[in-house]
Interface confidence: low
C-alpha cells in the first residue's frame, strides 16, 4: 500500500511507545558513541514530527522516506566528525547511498566500556525514580553494543527486563529474585544478538538466495506438515522482515513481523499443531514464541524421496523449468524428513544435489549420471556426526572450562594471527556447545551443535573482517557460508606462523585477580594460555597443561597470602622462569 506519509503510517501501526523505542534502537545502532541524552533528544524530535504527520499527512516533509527523515536527523549531530571520523562523510551523500554508508560503518566491536552491573538497591532506586528513562537506557546500551540486534526482539527483552524489576524490587530478597533473571536475560540476549548477526551476514555477504535456502530448511524442519507453498510464503515474508531489520528499517521490520505472526496464527491449522499456546500470547511474546517453537511431528506416511528426485524420468525437465523452485522442493522434502540434521548439513546436501544435476542434465544419459547422487550424501552426513561424537566425549571427559582450553589451543594453532581477545571470546563460546548440546539425545545433537557453531564462527568472521589479519580466516569466512565450520575444522597448525616474541609483561599478574569473579578469572587464565601458544605454537598438550596447572596453583597461593602483591611479584617471576624452562622459551 502506498501511504501519503510513511512516518505517520508506522506511528499509527506501531503506537507511540513502540515507535519511540524502535527509533531509539535505530539511532543507537547507527551512532554507537553518542551519549544517551543526545539520542533521547533526537528521538523526541522525530516523535513530535511524526505526530504532526499523523494529524495532517500533507504537512511539510511528511511525504519524505524514513531513511531521509532519520538520516537528516542523524546528520544534525554536532560532533559527528570528531566522534566518528569518516562516517561524517555519509552525510554528504543522497539516499539510498547515505543509509548504505551508515550501515557500512556499524561496528561489531565498538570501543565502549564494559557494562558493570550496579548494586541491586541502586538499580531498584533508579527503576523506581524514573522507570521510563531506566528502560530507555537499557535499549540504548544494548543497541549500541549490538548494532544488528533484532529490534522487535529487543522490545521483548525490554519487556522482560521491566517485569523483572517490577517484581523483584518489591521482593524480600531483591538480589536472589533479580540476579538470576538478569543473568538469564544477559545470556539469552548475547545468544539472540549472535543468531541475528548470522542472519544479517547471510543476507549481506551471500545474498537473499542464501538466506531463503536457510529459511526453507529451518521452517520445513519446524513445520513438516505444512505444504511446500505454505512454507514458501512464510520464507518470502520472513526474508522481507530480516532484510528490513538488517538494513536498519526497524519500523517496517517490526510492523511486518507483527503481520507475519498474525498470519501464522490465523493459519496455524495448515502450518503446525504446536502453535496454539504461542498464539494466545500478547504480540511480543507471541512473535518470540513462534520463533522458538518446537518442531511439529513429521507426517507418518511420507514417501521415499528417491521417487521424485532420483527415479523420476522428469528430474531434469523439472529442474530446467524452474531450478530454484525444484531445488527448494528438494530442500523442503529433505528437511521435513530430517529434524535430526543441522540446517547447514541440509544446505550442503542441497548444494551437492544441485551440482550433480547441473553436471548430469547436460550428460548423454542424465539418469545414469545422477542415479547414485544419494550415495554422495553419506560422507557429508557422517562428518558432522563423527565430529560431534568426538567433541562431546572430550567435553564429558574434561568439563566446560578445560574443554574451552582445548579449543583455545586448537584454534590458536590454526589461526595464531587473530587477536587474543577474539580467540578467547570465540573459543569460550565454541566450548559452550558442550553444555548446550551434548546433553541432548543423538537425534537433537547435530542441529543443536552445528547450527550453534555456525553462529559462533560468524562472530569470528565479523570480528576478523573489521581488522583482517589471517588469509585462512578470510578464506573460510568468505568461500561458502555452509562450509565455514568444515573449513575451520580442516585447518591444521599454521606452519608459516613466526612465534611471538616473549614479553614478561604479558605474564605479570597482580592481586586484583583475586577479587575477580570465577568467570573473569578464567578469562585471565585463558588469555595467558593463548599468549603461551602464540609464543610456543609447537608446545605439546602436556607442556601446556603443566604450565597452566602451575599458573592456577600460583594464583591460588598468592590469593591466600597476607601480602598478595609481593607474592604475585616474587612468585610470578619464578613462574615465568619455570614456564620458560618447561617450554624451552
Amino acid at each position: 500500500d502506498a501511504h501519503k506519509s510513511e512516518v505517520a503510517h508506522r506511528f499509527k501501526d506501531l503506537g507511540e511507545e513502540n515507535f519511540k523505542a524502535l527509533v531509539l534502537i535505530a539511532f543507537a545502532q547507527y551512532l554507537q558513541q553518542c551519549p544517551f541524552e543526545d539520542h533521547v533528544k533526537l528521538v523526541n524530535e522525530v516523535t513530535e514530527f511524526a505526530k504532526t504527520c499523523v494529524a495532517d499527512e500533507s504537512a511539510e516533509n511528511c511525504d519524505k522516506s524514513l531513511h531521509t527523515l532519520f538520516g537528516d536527523k542523524l546528520c544534525t549531530v554536532a560532533t559527528l566528525r570528531e566522534t566518528y571520523g569518516e562516517m561524517a562523510d555519509c552525510c554528504a551523500k543522497q539516499e539510498p547511498e547515505r543509509n548504505e554508508c551508515f550501515l557500512q560503518h556499524k561496528d561489531d566491536n565498538p570501543n565502549l566500556p564494559r557494562l558493570v552491573r550496579p548494586e541491586v538497591d541502586v538499580m531498584c532506586t533508579a527503576f523506581h525514580d524514573n522507570e521510563e528513562t531506566f528502560l530507555k537506557k537499557y535499549l540504548y546500551e544494548i543497541a549500541r553494543r549490538h548494532p544488528y540486534f533484532y529490534a522487535p526482539e529487543l522490545l521483548f527483552f525490554a519487556k522482560r527486563y521491566k517485569a523483572a524489576f517490577t517484581e523483584c524490587c518489591q521482593a524480600a530478597d531483591k538480589a536472589a529474585c533479580l540476579l538470576p533473571k538478569l543473568d538469564e536475560l544477559r545470556d539469552e540476549g548475547k545468544a539472540s544478538s549472535a543468531k541475528q548477526r548470522l542472519k544479517c551476514a547471510s543476507l549481506q555477504k551471500f545474498g537473499e538466495r542464501a538466506f531463503k535456502a536457510w529459511a526453507v530448511a529451518r521452517l520445513s524442519q519446524r513445520f513438516p506438515k505444512a505444504e511446500f507453498a505454505e512454507v514458501s510464503k512464510l520464507v518470502t515474508d520472513l526474508t522481507k522482515v530480516h532484510t528490513e531489520c538488517c538494513h536498519g528499517d526497524l519500523l517496517e521490520c517490526a510492523d511486518d513481523r507483527a503481520d507475519l505472526a498474525k498470519y501464522i496464527c490465523e493459519n496455524q491449522d495448515s502450518i503446525s499443531s504446536k502453535l496454539k499456546e504461542c498464539c494466545e500470547k500478547p504480540l511480543l511474546e507471541k512473535s518470540h514464541c513462534i520463533a522458538e517453537v518446537e518442531n511439529d511431528e513429521m507426517p507418518a506416511d511420507l514417501p521415499s524421496l528417491a521417487a521424485d528426485f532420483v527415479e523420476s524420468k522428469d528430474v531434469c525437465k523439472n529442474y530446467a523449468e524452474a531450478k530454484d523452485v525444484f531445488l527448494g522442493m528438494f530442500l523442503y522434502e529433505y528437511a521435513r524428513r530430517h529434524p535430526d540434521y543441522s540446517v547447514v548439513l541440509l544446505l550442503r546436501l542441497a548444494k551437492t544435489y544441485e551440482t550433480t544435476l547441473e553436471k548430469c542434465c547436460a550428460a548423454a544419459d542424465p539418469h545414469e549420471c545422477y542415479a547414485k547422487v544419494f550415495d554422495e550424501f553419506k560422507p557429508l552426513v557422517e562428518e558432522p556426526q563423527n565430529l560431534i561424537k568426538q567433541n562431546c566425549e572430550l567435553f564429558e571427559q574434561l568439563g566446560e572450562y578445560k574443554f574451552q582450553n582445548a579449543l583455545l589451543v586448537r584454534y590458536t594453532k590454526k589461526v595464531p594471527q587473530v587477536s587474543t581477545p577474539t580467540l578467547v571470546e570465540v573459543s569460550r563460546n565454541l566450548g559452550k556447545v558442550g553444555s548446550k548440546c551434548c546433553k541432548h539425545p543423538e537425534a537433537k545433537r547435530m542441529p543443536c551443535a552445528e547450527d550453534y557453531l555456525s553462529v559462533v564462527l560468524n562472530q569470528l568472521c565479523v570480528l576478523h573482517e573489521k581488522t583482517p589479519v589471517s588469509d585462512r580466516v578470510t578464506k573460510c569466512c568468505t568461500e561458502s557460508l555452509v562450509n565455514r565450520r568444515p573449513c575451520f575444522s580442516a585447518l591444521e597448525v599454521d606452519e608459516t606462523y613466526v612465534p611471538k616474541e616473549f614479553n614478561a609483561e604479558t605474564f605479570t599478574f597482580h592481586a586484583d585477580i583475586c577479587t575477580l569473579s570465577e568467570k573473569e578469572r578464567q578469562i585471565k587464565k585463558q588469555t595467558a594460555l593463548v599468549e603461551l601458544v602464540k609464543h610456543k605454537p609447537k608446545a605439546t598438550k602436556e607442556q601446556l597443561k603443566a604450565v597452566m596447572d602451575d599458573f592456577a596453583a600460583f594464583v591460588e597461593k598468592c590469593c591466600k597470602a597476607d601480602d598478595k602483591e609481593t607474592c604475585f611479584a616474587e612468585e610470578g617471576k619464578k613462574l615465568v622462569a619455570a614456564s620458560q624452562a618447561a617450554l624451552g622459551l
Epitope: P180, K181, D183, E184, F395, E396, G399, E400, G434, S435, C438, K439, H440, P441, E518
Partner: nanobody, 115 residues
Framework: EVQLVESGGGLVQPGGSLRLSCAAS????????MSWFRQAPGKEREFVSA????????RYAESVKGRFTISRDNSKNTLYLQMNSLRAEDTAVYYC????????GGQGTTVTVSS
C-alpha cells in the same frame, strides 16, 4: 532423553529438616553445573542454590544462606539439598535444573512447612 526426578519433599514442622534428592539421567551429569529453584503457590520460580560440575563452587540465595546446603554425588548422578531450620516461607515446590536456567527442570517435589 534428559530426565531429572526430584524426591524427598513432605510435610515438616517449622525448625525441622528435610533432604531433597534429584536423580539425573540421559546426560553426563558430572560435566554440568546444577541448581535448585523453588516456586511457591501464586509466585514465580525463584533461585535457591547452585553448584558447579565438580562440587567446589556453591551459591545460595540470601534467604536460605546458613540453613540450606547443596551437594552432589557424581558417581550416583544425584544432586542434594539439605534443608535445616525450615520456615513457613520455605513452603514451595522445589525443582532441580541443569545450569542456572529457571525454565528447565523436573516435575518437582513439594515441601510444606506448617505446624
Amino acid at each position: 532423553e534428559v530426565q531429572l526426578v526430584e524426591s524427598g519433599g513432605g510435610l515438616v514442622q517449622p525448625g525441622g529438616s528435610l533432604r531433597l534428592s534429584c536423580a539425573a539421567s540421559g546426560f553426563t551429569f558430572g560435566s554440568f553445573g546444577m541448581s535448585w529453584f523453588r516456586q511457591a503457590p501464586g509466585k514465580e520460580r525463584e533461585f535457591v542454590s547452585a553448584i558447579d560440575s565438580g562440587g567446589a563452587d556453591t551459591r545460595y540465595a540470601e534467604s536460605v544462606k546458613g540453613r540450606f546446603t547443596i551437594s552432589r554425588d557424581n558417581s550416583k548422578n544425584t544432586l542434594y539439598l539439605q534443608m535445616n531450620s525450615l520456615r513457613a516461607e520455605d513452603t514451595a515446590v522445589y525443582y532441580c535444573t541443569i545450569g542456572r536456567s529457571a525454565s528447565r527442570g523436573g516435575q518437582g517435589t513439594t515441601v510444606t512447612v506448617s505446624s
